[in-house]
Interface confidence: low
C-alpha cells in the first residue's frame, strides 16, 4: 500500500484508567497531514465520536478508560499530499493494584515510571500525564506506599512533587493521581513511580550539575560533523574530572585508531560562587554505528547522555 513503516516501542499500561497516545513523528506530522488510527490491521478506522470509549481525538487515540481487552497493535497512518507513513504501537494492558503488595511490580518500566532523587538535595518527581486538549486534568495528589504525602518537605507544583532535603527514607513506591474530565465525565488517572535515591559525593563535597546534555536524543544526518558541548557547573574548589565516555570507555581511547570521535579541550568561566565548565565531543563524521549509543558526559558522580538519532527521511518527495 506504499506506506512506510516505523515501529514504536511497546507501551505497558494499567487497566481501568484513561490512556492516550499522540501520533506524532516530526517532521512528518509538522506539515499538512491527515492522521487516522486503526486497530490490529483493521480497515475500519477508530471512531472519531467523542462519546465512544475508544476514539480518535485529532492526532491522539484516547481510551476512556483502558480495558483488559484493549491490548494489541494499533496503527496510526499519517498521510501527506505525496506521502504515507505508518506508526505501530503495541499496547499491553495489565491489572495493577497499586496498594496490593502481593502483586509484582510493573514489567519493563519506562523511565517515566522510574525516577531518582538525589540524597541531601532539593529535588522533584514528575507526574507524566499525556492527554489531548479535550481532557481537563484536575489537581494532582501524591501518594507514597498508598498514603497521601503530607509534610513541610513536600510541595506539589503543577505536575511535580518538590522534595526538599531528600533522605534515604524517600525511596520507595510513589503514585500520582489526577481526576481527568472529558465530555462531562470524570476518570481517575493513577501513575505508579518507583523512586530510588542516588548518593551525593563523599567527603561532604557538592555534586556537579550537568546543565547540558539532558539525557536526550539529537537528530543528525549520516556523514555530518557534529559538536556537542557538555556544560557543567561545579564549586570553585572542586577536584572533579569532566570527560566524555562511550561503552564506559573514554572516547579518545575508544576511537584511538580512527580518531573519528574526539573529546575537546576543557574550558571554564569563573563566576562568584561557581565555575561553568565546557568540554565538547566532536564527531568528525557521523556513522551508522553511532546511532543508538549513549555518549555519556561525566562530571564527578554526575552523568548525562546524548543519543544520536537518524532523522526521519524527507517524505514530501515521494
Amino acid at each position: 500500500d506504499g506506506c512506510k513503516d516505523i515501529f514504536m516501542k511497546n507501551e505497558i499500561l494499567s487497566a481501568s484508567q484513561p490512556f492516550a497516545f499522540n501520533c506524532t513523528f516530526p517532521p512528518i506530522t509538522s506539515g499538512e497531514v491527515s492522521v487516522t488510527w486503526y486497530k490490529n490491521s483493521s480497515k475500519i478506522p477508530v471512531s472519531k465520536i467523542i462519546q465512544s470509549r475508544i476514539h480518535q481525538d485529532e492526532t491522539w487515540i484516547l481510551f476512556l478508560p483502558m480495558e483488559w481487552g484493549d491490548s494489541g497493535v494499533y496503527q496510526c497512518v499519517i498521510k501527506g499530499r505525496d506521502s504515507c507513513h505508518r506508526i505501530h504501537v503495541n499496547l499491553t494492558v495489565f491489572e495493577k493494584h497499586w496498594c496490593d503488595t502481593s502483586i509484582g511490580g510493573l514489567p519493563n518500566l519506562s523511565d517515566e515510571y522510574k525516577q531518582i532523587l538525589h540524597l541531601g538535595k532539593d529535588d522533584s518527581l514528575t507526574c507524566h500525564l499525556h492527554f489531548p486538549k479535550s481532557c481537563v486534568l484536575g489537581p494532582i495528589k501524591w501518594y507514597k506506599d498508598c498514603n497521601e504525602i503530607k509534610g513541610e518537605r513536600f510541595t506539589v507544583l503543577e505536575t511535580r512533587l518538590l522534595v526538599s532535603n531528600v533522605s534515604a527514607e524517600d525511596r520507595g513506591n510513589y503514585a500520582c493521581q489526577a481526576i481527568l474530565t472529558h465530555s462531562g465525565k470524570q476518570y481517575e488517572v493513577l501513575n505508579g513511580i518507583t523512586v530510588s535515591i542516588t548518593e551525593r559525593a563523599g567527603y561532604g563535597g557538592s555534586v556537579p550539575k550537568i546543565i547540558y546534555p539532558k539525557n536526550h536524543s539529537i537528530e543528525v544526518q549520516l556523514g555530518t560533523t557534529l559538536i556537542v558541548d557538555c556544560n557543567v557547573t561545579d564549586t570553585k574548589d572542586n577536584t572533579n574530572l569532566r570527560c566524555w565516555r562511550v561503552n564506559n570507555t573514554l572516547v579518545d581511547d575508544y576511537y584511538d585508531e580512527s580518531k573519528r570521535i574526539r573529546e575537546g579541550v576543557e574550558t571554564h568561566v569563573s563566576f562568584r560562587e561557581h565555575n561553568l565548565y565546557t568540554v565538547n565531543i566532536t564527531f568528525l563524521e557521523v556513522k551508522m554505528e553511532d546511532y543508538g549509543l549513549p555518549f555519556m558526559c561525566h562530571a564527578g558522580v554526575s552523568t548525562a547522555y546524548i543519543i544520536l538519532q537518524l532523522p526521519a527521511p524527507d517524505f514530501r518527495a515521494y
Epitope: 500500500d1 490491521s41 549520516l222
Partner: antibody, heavy 130, light 107 residues
Framework: EVQLLESGGGLVQPGGSLRLSCAAS????????MSWVRQAPGKGLEWVSG????????YYADSVKGRFTISRDNSKNTLYLQMNSLRAEDTAVYYC???????????????????????WGQGTLVTVSS | DIQMTQSPSSLSASVGDRVTITCRAS??????LNWYQQKPGKAPKLLIY???NLQSGVPSRFSGSGSGTDFTLTISSLQPEDFATYYC?????????FGGGTKVEIK
C-alpha cells in the same frame, strides 16, 4: 549461524500454483521484516513481496498483486510465498531475504529503520512452462 | 513506483582501477539506497546500506555516497574478486525497486 533456506520450487504449468517456503535460523525471526526477491534467467533482480515482523503488514510488487500471497509462521521461523495463476514470466530463481534493521532509541520510543536485505537464501528455481 | 536507473549497464576495467557506478532515482529517496554485489549462480550480497554505510565484513575499498536522487558506488582499487554485477535498490517506499544492474568485466 544466520541462515535462510528456500524450498518448494519446481516445474509448474501456466495457471498452476506453487508454495515456496523459507526456513530461517540463527536470528530472532520476529524482529525482522522479510522479503521475496526473484531473478528471471539472465535478468536483473526484482523485489516481489515483503512482510513485517509480526506478519500484520504485507507488501507486493504490482506484477504479482492479487496472485501471490506472502505469509509467515513465527512459531516455526518460516516464511511462505503462495503463488497462484502462474505465468511464463514468473519463471525465475526466487530468493528469500531478511530486511536489515537499525534500532534508533529516542526519548520514549525506539524507531526501527528497515534497510537493505542483509541475509539471503540460496534461491529456489520456479519454472512455469507447458 | 520509483524507478531506479543504473549506469553504465556494463564496464570493462583492470585490476587496480578505480570504478564508479551511478544510480539515479526517479524521485527523492533521501538516503534509503542500498548496493548489492552478485556473482553468477550466487545470491546477492549487501555491500552498502543507507547510501554510505559499509555492511559488516565488506572490504573498505567499497564506498557509497549520495542522497536525494543521485547515488554513487565506488570501488577504489578493483580486485579480481570484484568482477561481478552490481545492483542498487531503494527501500524508501514499497514496492522496493532495483536498478537494472552494472556488470563489471575484466578488460
Amino acid at each position: 549461524e544466520v541462515q535462510l533456506l528456500e524450498s518448494g520450487g519446481g516445474l509448474v504449468q501456466p495457471g498452476g500454483s506453487l508454495r515456496l517456503s523459507c526456513a530461517a535460523s540463527g536470528f530472532t525471526f520476529t524482529s525482522h521484516a522479510m522479503s521475496w526477491v526473484r531473478q528471471a534467467p539472465g535478468k536483473g533482480l526484482e523485489w516481489v513481496s515483503g512482510i513485517s515482523g509480526s506478519g500484520a503488514n504485507t507488501y507486493y510488487a504490482d506484477s504479482v498483486k492479487g496472485r501471490f500471497t506472502i505469509s509467515r509462521d513465527n512459531s516455526k521461523n518460516t516464511l511462505y510465498l503462495q503463488m497462484n495463476s502462474l505465468r511464463a514470466e514468473d519463471t525465475a530463481v526466487y530468493y528469500c531475504a531478511r530486511d536489515g534493521i537499525v534500532v534508533v532509541p529516542a526519548a520514549n520510543h525506539s524507531y526501527y529503520y528497515y534497510y537493505g536485505m542483509d541475509v539471503w537464501g540460496q534461491g529456489t528455481l520456479v519454472t512455469v512452462s507447458s | 513506483d520509483i524507478q531506479m536507473t543504473q549506469s553504465p549497464s556494463s564496464l570493462s576495467a583492470s585490476v587496480g582501477d578505480r570504478v564508479t557506478i551511478t544510480c539515479r532515482a526517479s524521485q527523492s529517496i533521501s538516503v534509503h539506497l542500498n548496493w548489492y554485489q552478485q556473482k553468477p549462480g550466487k545470491a546477492p550480497k549487501l555491500l552498502i546500506y543507507i547510501a554510505s554505510n559499509l555492511q559488516s565484513g565488506v572490504p573498505s575499498r567499497f564506498s557509497g555516497s549520495g542522497s536525494g536522487t543521485d547515488f554513487t558506488l565506488t570501488i577504489s582499487s578493483l580486485q579480481p574478486e570484484d568482477f561481478a554485477t552490481y545492483y542498487c535498490q531503494q527501500t524508501y517506499t514499497t514496492p522496493y525497486t532495483f536498478g537494472g544492474g552494472t556488470k563489471v568485466e575484466i578488460k
